[in-house]
């Protein structure tokens, strides 16, 4: 998954289109629904934060 | 300080279309997702539609796919809602919310809400 | 869709009251539960999110706490600007948002 100008995001994140920016897997495992999920590696880390602010 | 200042509803009949409109002020619009809320009288809380920062993702409920259409112009700091085919049940106040910078996480701040009635 | 189930749908109680209202969840959602207070005629305002965190401005009397299906709003001693009805939303299933059907708290 890439953000637009073909800027890669970085290891363990992948592209939201719903947020235009880049998002912690790390979340996945809580929230699989998320749409940047489907870019993330099927085995994401077991510690995950939450990305609340 | 954050406002979000709904206009465009009115009374319209079954069958026809309104355009909302919702101008934000008090912060920058462009990086945040905007949603679309409305409240049938006497009733609860129905979530419409979102919008991606960019306009480039949207999002429905599937009580309105195909008829609302979603849109913003972040030149103007306005989120739009086009409406058509309107039903009985879509009478309601429909509010403009900001969605949080994480991901469809909470509606942090909120118009004042316009009322759409569709009746003949 | 998650369906969000509040209860009661109504409570009466006085000022200095404690005021408890729960939300529950048709199936978990982890800590992605937000609550809303509505007073007539006005726009909801966010009160916590992600479950227990509490939004900027708001009195400390308000609380939130739970996990997975099952959630709780309280509010420590019941406040005249506190009647007003209130509502959890859940945020696990994007993008189908959904919101429980409303508490009104009203004045004994």
């Known amino acids: 998954e890439q953000a637009p100008g073909n800027a890669p995001c970085s290891s363990g994140s992948s592209w939201s289109a719903d947020l235009d920016k880049c998002m912690d897997c790390a979340s996945c495992p809580a929230r699989p629904h998320s749409d940047f999920c489907l870019g993330c590696a099927a085995a994401p880390p077991a510690h995950f934060r939450m990305l609340w602010p | 300080e954050v406002q979000l200042l709904e206009s465009g509803g009115g009374l319209v009949q079954p069958g026809g279309s309104l355009r909302l409109s919702c101008a934000a002020s008090g912060f920058t619009f462009s990086p945040y997702p905007m949603m679309w809320v409305r409240q049938a009288p006497g009733k609860g809380l129905e979530w419409v539609s979102y919008?991606?920062?960019?306009?480039?993702?949207?999002h429905y409920a599937d009580s309105v796919k195909g008829r609302f259409t979603i849109s913003r112009d972040n030149s103007k700091n306005t989120l739009y809602l086009q409406m058509n085919s309107l039903r009985a049940e879509d009478t309601a106040v429909y509010y403009c919310?900001?969605?949080?910078?994480?991901?469809?996480?909470?509606?942090?701040?909120w118009g004042q809400g316009t009322l759409v009635t569709v009746s003949s | 869709d998650i369906q969000m189930t509040q209860s009661p749908s109504s409570l009466s109680a006085s000022v200095g009251d404690r005021v408890t209202i729960t939300c529950r969840a048709s199936?978990?959602?982890?800590?992605?539960l937000n609550w809303y207070q509505q007073k007539p005629g006005k726009a909801p305002k966010l009160l916590i999110y992600?479950?227990?965190s509490l939004q900027s401005g708001v009195p400390s009397r308000f609380s939130g706490s739970g996990s997975g299906t099952d959630f709780t709003l309280t509010i420590s001693s019941l406040q005249p600007e506190d009647f007003a009805t209130y509502y959890c939303q859940q945020s696990y299933s994007t993008p189908g948002i959904t919101f429980g059907q409303g508490t009104k708290v009203e004045i004994k």
């Open positions: 199936q978990s959602i982890s800590s992605y």
């Open positions: 919008i991606s920062p960019s306009g480039g993702s949207t």
């Open positions: 919310a900001r969605g949080g910078d994480t991901y469809f996480d909470y509606f942090d701040y």
């Open positions: 992600a479950a227990s």
